[in-house]
Interface confidence: low
């Protein structure tokens, strides 16, 4: 039954509030080993970057994408690479840094995209359980049948940041994605050493606003890894 699923040990490793199941009797949730806690702080240890092998963009940080490190390199060897800034060449949205998307092979600002009549691609959501959803079927989210005619306000459902009003970005909240505020100076942010902590986190924060970067709070240097706070600070 649904209740036994919710109470079973099968979900004991899931971070909150993943212990729930969709309203379908008999549906089950299988835990993904090593799933990260919201904010990615549980496994944050050092700020210096180490190349991290990956198979897809979801395994990399918010400001990274997954690709071969050399042009025309071995497709079997991929690592998380730094995202591409505005006006840089791209092949897909994930290659562009937060606040940008890939249009005609160039990373452009999402702000320039006041309303796109077409959603370029259908996004497969990753729910931290091996890409399967609660009912065991792959969930593909598309807005083709219900376009956003007005920009989403804070807390409303979105597919990507361009669906949100100015000053907001689209970020995961539980198993949804909602419009959240772009972070201001001094606000708590999430520093991803690598992307495992991004693709699987159940809550996501927006990126820091222009001129800010996510760095460890000065008075938290002595704190344990699990309790370190990062805040948006001036470059």
């Amino acid at each position: 039954t649904l209740n036994s699923v919710l109470n079973s040990n099968a979900i004991k490793n899931l971070p909150p509030p993943l212990g729930g199941a969709a309203g379908h009797p008999g549906s089950a949730v299988s835990a993904a080993p090593g799933i990260l806690y919201p904010g990615g702080n549980k496994y944050q240890t050092i700020d210096n970057y180490q190349p991290y092998p990956c198979a897809e963009d979801e395994e990399c940080g918010t400001d990274e994408y997954c690709a071969s490190p050399t042009r025309g390199g071995d497709a079997g060897v991929q690592i998380c690479l730094a995202c591409r800034k505005r006006r840089k060449r791209c092949m897909r949205h994930a290659m562009c840094c937060p606040g940008n998307y890939c249009k005609n092979g160039i990373c452009v600002s999402s702000d320039q995209n006041h309303f796109r009549g077409e959603i370029e691609e259908t996004i497969t959501e990753s729910f931290g359980n091996d890409h399967s959803t609660l009912d065991g079927y792959s969930r593909r989210t598309t807005l083709s049948s219900k376009m956003y005619h007005t920009k989403g306000q804070e807390g409303s459902v979105c597919l990507r940041s361009s669906d949100c009003a100015s000053g907001l970005c689209c970020a995961r909240h539980f198993w949804s994605k909602i419009c959240k505020p772009v972070l201001k100076e001094g606000q708590v942010c999430t520093k991803h050493r690598r992307k495992g902590s991004h693709g699987l986190e159940i809550f996501q924060r927006c990126y820091c606003g222009e001129g800010l970067s996510c760095r460890i709070q000065k008075d938290h240097h002595q704190a344990s890894n699990s309790s370190r706070l990062h805040t948006c600070q001036r470059h």
Epitope: P15, G19, G39, L134, E154, G155, S156, G186, S226
Partner: antibody, heavy 118, light 111 residues
Framework: QVQLVESGGGLVQPGGSLRLSCAAS????????MSWVRQAPGKGLEWVSS??????????WYAAGVKGRFTISRDNSKNTLYLQMNSLRAEDTAVYYC?????????WGQGTLVTVSS | DIALTQPASVSGSPGQSITISCTGT?????????VSWYQQHPGKAPKLMIY???NRPSGVSNRFSGSKSGNTASLTISGLQAEDEADYYC???????????FGGGTKLTVL
């Protein structure tokens, strides 16, 4: 202006049932996930249950103490959230608040009182 | 009954600053940098004052601020005013059966 109005509370005997409703207005109800939070007389807040919006498959969560007895549901066409409460116990006596969960519980109704007593 | 630990009451004079603490464990508040604070006046519904540790929703006075270190979160109210007298609740997320946890509440008295 966001408005949430609860109804359906009242006096019920232990073991009885009650269905609470929450009428929402002033925002796109279907785009938000919603929750019920209760507060026993003179006590603190206690989360009861939450339900996602349609695009997230109406995923539901329940607090351990109500699991199997309470059922949360929603009707987007009516902009209404429901809480079906069965096998009620004295300890379920509380004011039940309907809350919009945008970024945390950002809007609350005024609550409806449920009293379970013989 | 899982709950975050808050002092039952705190008090301060107008113009002063007060801090309300909220202590949890590594399974709830300590494990997530997602702490919210709510204000509740008698007979009224709660109101979100702080989310994500230190973020204020629009319309909330900048006299209210939040912080967190380890398993403890804090709400600071500066320039205390009479209308700040209310109950304050912290809220976080937790592993296990209870997904959302609240503190027991703190009654703030403005002297």
């Amino acid at each position: 202006q966001v408005q949430l109005v609860e109804s359906g509370g009242g006096l019920v005997q232990p073991g009885g049932s009650l269905r609470l409703s929450c009428a929402a207005s002033g925002f796109t109800f279907s785009s938000y996930w919603m929750s019920w939070v209760r507060q026993a007389p003179g006590k603190g807040l206690e989360w009861v249950s939450s339900i996602e919006h349609k695009d997230a498959g109406y995923t539901t969560w329940y607090a351990a103490g109500v699991k199997g007895r309470f059922t949360i549901s929603r009707d987007n066409s009516k902009n209404t959230l429901y809480l079906q409460m069965n096998s009620l116990r004295a300890e379920d006596t509380a004011v039940y608040y309907c809350a919009r969960h945008g970024i945390d519980f950002d809007h609350w109704g005024q609550g409806t009182l449920v009293t379970v007593s013989s | 009954d899982i709950a975050l630990t808050q002092p039952a009451s705190v008090s301060g004079s107008p113009g002063q600053s007060i801090t309300i603490s909220c202590t949890g464990t590594s399974s709830d508040l300590g494990g997530y940098n997602y702490v919210s604070w709510y204000q509740q006046h008698p007979g009224k519904a709660p109101k979100l004052m702080i989310y994500d540790v230190n973020n204020r929703p629009s319309g909330v006075s900048n006299r209210f601020s939040g912080s967190k270190s380890g398993n403890t979160a804090s709400l600071t109210i500066s320039g205390l005013q009479a209308e700040d007298e209310a109950d304050y609740y912290c809220q976080s997320y937790a592993s296990g059966n209870t997904k959302v946890v609240f503190g027991g509440g703190t009654k703030l008295t403005v002297l």
